[in-house]
């Protein structure tokens, strides 16, 4: 019961986490700029992985996609890749974990198969969570680096003058969503891995089988010490070795030439 609960909870936590990673990846608010006032209008700028947006004090908002791939910073490309890998791994993990859930019966799937699938999905969730956390952290680091590099930066270009505007870019909501979602996916993955240990059978119980030995037709009879416990009809505390192939419930009631004290 505890295993089922752990597995189910791990699945739900991972599901929420992956939904969060998808949401963070699609959000525009990865970096937000403090309100910049100029003679025309107050401008609020925010950027995501896929487009950059500007909102004016009038409420008008314009978003432009990053249509070029070559002109984009390598770090931004890396963050995109990490987030997409995280989503793909998470989605595959969810698919695998659905079939691995103990509460869902699919044909005659054995517990060992479910255990393996649970472990696989757990590892996928852990890697997915780590990808999301890494992606968000790389972006955050890029923001911090850009802020310090842009401080008091001014240069002349093509006859005109280019001046860096001193407006601080802060961490957007998407970063926090990404960190939390990545953490949840990671926790869910760990829970799935813990559940896997409970699902895996500790030891395999084989049915008793007796074998005919060559030569004197001597066969070892499993459960031969059963009489010593005080149960069964053999009360002489004998080890029972029977030449015939019988089940363990057939206790010998007469002596034979193969009985040994």
């Amino acid at each position: 019961m505890a295993v089922t609960a752990c597995q189910g909870l791990g699945f739900v936590v991972s599901l929420i986490g992956i939904a969060g990673i998808i949401a963070a990846t699609c959000m525009d608010q990865w970096s937000t700029q403090d309100l910049y006032n100029n003679p025309v209008t107050a401008v609020f700028n925010y950027q995501g992985l896929w487009r950059s947006c500007v909102r004016e004090s009038s409420g008008f908002t314009e978003c432009r996609g990053y249509f070029t791939l070559l002109g984009l910073p390598a770090m931004l490309q890396a963050v995109r890749a990490l987030m997409i890998v995280g989503i793909v791994l998470g989605a595959i993990g969810l698919l695998v974990s659905i079939f691995a859930l103990k509460c869902i019966r699919i044909g005659s799937m054995e517990d060992s198969a479910k255990a393996n699938m649970t472990l696989t999905s757990g590892i996928m969730f852990i890697v997915s969570g780590l990808c999301a956390i890494a992606g968000v952290s790389v972006f955050a680091n890029m923001l911090v680096t850009n802020f310090w590099m842009s401080t008091a930066n001014m240069y002349t270009g093509m006859g005109g003058m280019v001046q860096t505007v001193q407006t601080r870019y802060t961490f957007g909501a998407a970063l926090f969503v990404g960190w939390v979602a990545g953490g949840l996916t990671l926790i869910g993955g760990v829970m799935m891995c813990i559940a896997c240990r409970g699902l895996a059978p500790e030891e395999t119980n084989y049915k008793a089988v007796s074998y005919h030995a060559s030569g004197h037709s001597v066969a070892y009879k499993p459960g031969g010490f059963k009489a010593s416990t005080g149960f069964g009809s053999n009360t002489k505390n004998k080890k029972i070795y029977d030449g015939g192939a019988r089940t363990e419930d057939e206790v010998q009631s007469y002596p034979s030439k193969h009985d040994y004290v």
Epitope: S57, S58, M142, V165
Partner: nanobody, 120 residues
Framework: QVQLQESGGGLVQPGGSLRLSCAAS????????MGWYRQAPGKQRELVAG???????NYGDSVKGRFTISRDNAKNTVYLQMNSLKPEDTAVYYC??????????????WGQGTLVTVSE
């Protein structure tokens, strides 16, 4: 790197018209504000007109009703239509744009200026 290309300046008679244009190129994500400033000899640089992406405009007191600013967002270009020009409009006109040029990077870029002379 962001570059501005200004054009349209020249000599014009009082009461005449001129159209200035300024095109931005380079690493550009957004251009929230585009505008024109001018600086007459021995005077401070002053705002002529500015326009936001959404079309919000602001004009300097001395040019209201005579000058019209417009922009083409697709071409990252701003235009200044100057009508009923006066001798006191003589100045170097500078294009000014606020450019979001990268992740966490906002630049204020100035053009090299184009001279407008209003004279008989």
């Amino acid at each position: 790197q962001v570059q501005l290309q200004e054009s349209g300046g020249g000599l014009v008679q009082p009461g005449g018209s001129l159209r200035l244009s300024c095109a931005a190129s380079g690493s550009i994500f957004n251009i929230p504000v585009m505008g024109w400033y001018r600086q007459a000899p021995g005077k401070q640089r002053e705002l002529v007109a500015g326009i936001s992406t959404g079309g919000t405009t602001n004009y300097g007191d001395s040019v209201k009703g005579r000058f019209t600013i417009s922009r083409d967002n697709a071409k990252n270009t701003v235009y200044l239509q100057m009508n009923s020009l006066k001798p006191e409009d003589t100045a170097v006109y500078y294009c000014n744009v606020l450019v979001v040029s990268g992740i966490g990077s906002t630049l204020e870029v100035w053009g090299q200026g184009t001279l407008v002379t209003v004279s008989e």
